[in-house]
């Protein structure tokens, strides 16, 4: 691509940098953990780590005073805040996809096993529609490891 064709990418990048997608992550994790609860699994068994916010001092999280509430009491609140954030990407499907990819990347280390990963991915794909937004047609949610070095 010509380098100045990337300008749209940078405007999307600007939005992604400023977006607080943590409510989306919280909403989805609560959702899949509630599903597991209904199948008799305890998401808070000692073998599993509870959610801990990512260590980024520049990203304060006003929504998350504690780990995921397993009763799901705050889930609708998280979903509303999540939808408000995703609404910013409504008219740019490629950017919406990148937002979903970022959510997947942020949570990939916290998902236990292939089954939970697939379930998270499935819920993530449905997230825009849950918010009454258009879902991106083609959006690869496979997690790449790290960035690309250039020396």
């Amino acid at each position: 691509r010509q380098q100045w064709e990337l300008q749209g990418d940078r405007r999307c990048q600007s939005q992604l940098e400023r977006a607080n997608l943590r409510p989306c992550e919280q909403h989805l994790m609560q959702k899949i953990q509630r599903d597991e609860d209904s199948y008799g699994r305890d998401p808070y068994s000692p073998s599993q780590d509870p959610y801990s916010p990512s260590q980024d001092p520049d990203r304060r999280d006003p929504y998350s005073p504690s780990p995921y509430d397993r009763r799901g009491a705050g889930s609708s609140q998280h979903q509303e805040r999540c939808c408000n954030e995703l609404n910013e990407f409504e008219n740019n499907q490629r950017c919406m996809c990148e937002a979903l990819q970022q959510i997947m990347e942020n949570q990939s280390d916290r998902l236990q096993g292939r089954q939970q990963e697939q379930q998270f991915k499935r819920e993530l794909r449905n997230l825009p529609q849950q918010c009454g937004l258009r879902a991106p047609q083609r959006c690869d949610l496979e997690v790449e490891s790290g960035g690309r070095d250039r020396y």
Partner: antibody, heavy 112, light 109 residues
């Protein structure tokens, strides 16, 4: 963002300035490079995205600047070649498309 | 292009700095204007005050306000404080090259 120390170079030489990021996920944000000659305004040189591998340079610096990075040590680099006296300036790296965080600056002096 | 090049305002008074972009910085897909305002105090690195033309960066006092549309933008300091003495720059980041304005030097009258 912590930048490397001051450099003194001769005309025609190259300089490589480093910018070490910490406290956030390096691949999440773009890095820009901006320079400022003494008593002058800010001049945008270009940008790099460590996640996508993309870079873009201002026309003025084309063929003379290379922006690179090492994700494993969360460090960005800006190399400027064929230095001339008018390249004497403070060089800043900045985080994010809108430059929300700035390095402390690296003074590059070009003098014979 | 920024105007004026320099500005002297009394303490407690309003200061207004203008910035004109050569092209629109509005992204119609998200209705955001990709223009930022920076403050640089003598001997210091620049600091982001406003992004997306009107969104205040966290920690920036609410006396700083960004406004404007299309190609004409304004930074307003509602009540000038002594610590506001600095050079102010606008920057468009709608499309590369992400050019800065030439700067406006703000002093106390």
């Amino acid at each position: 963002l912590v930048q490397s120390g001051a450099e003194v170079k001769k005309p025609g030489a190259s300089v490589k300035v480093s910018c070490k990021a910490s406290g956030y996920t390096f691949t999440r944000y773009d890095i820009n490079w901006v320079r400022q000659a003494t008593g002058q305004g800010l001049e945008w040189m270009g940008w790099m995205n460590p996640k996508s591998g993309e870079t873009g340079y201002a026309q003025k610096f084309h063929g003379r600047v290379i922006m690179s990075w090492n994700t494993s040590i969360s460090t960005a680099y800006m190399e400027l070649s064929s230095l001339r006296s008018e390249d004497t300036a403070v060089y800043y790296c900045t985080r994010g498309v809108d430059s929300g965080v700035w390095g402390q600056g690296t003074t590059v002096t070009v003098s014979s | 292009t920024q105007s004026p090049d320099s500005l002297a305002v009394s303490l407690g008074e309003r200061a207004t700095i203008n910035c004109k972009s050569s092209q629109s910085v509005l992204d119609s897909s998200n209705n955001k204007k990709f223009l930022a305002w920076f403050q640089q105090k003598p001997g210091q690195r620049p600091k982001l005050l406003i992004y997306w033309a009107s969104t205040r960066e966290s920690g920036v006092p609410d006396r700083f306000t960004g406004s404007g549309s299309g190609t004409d933008f304004t930074l307003t300091i509602s009540s000038l404080q002594a610590e506001d003495v600095a050079v102010y720059y606008c920057q468009q980041y709608y499309s590369p090259p992400h050019t800065f304005g030439q700067g406006t030097k703000l002093e106390i009258k």
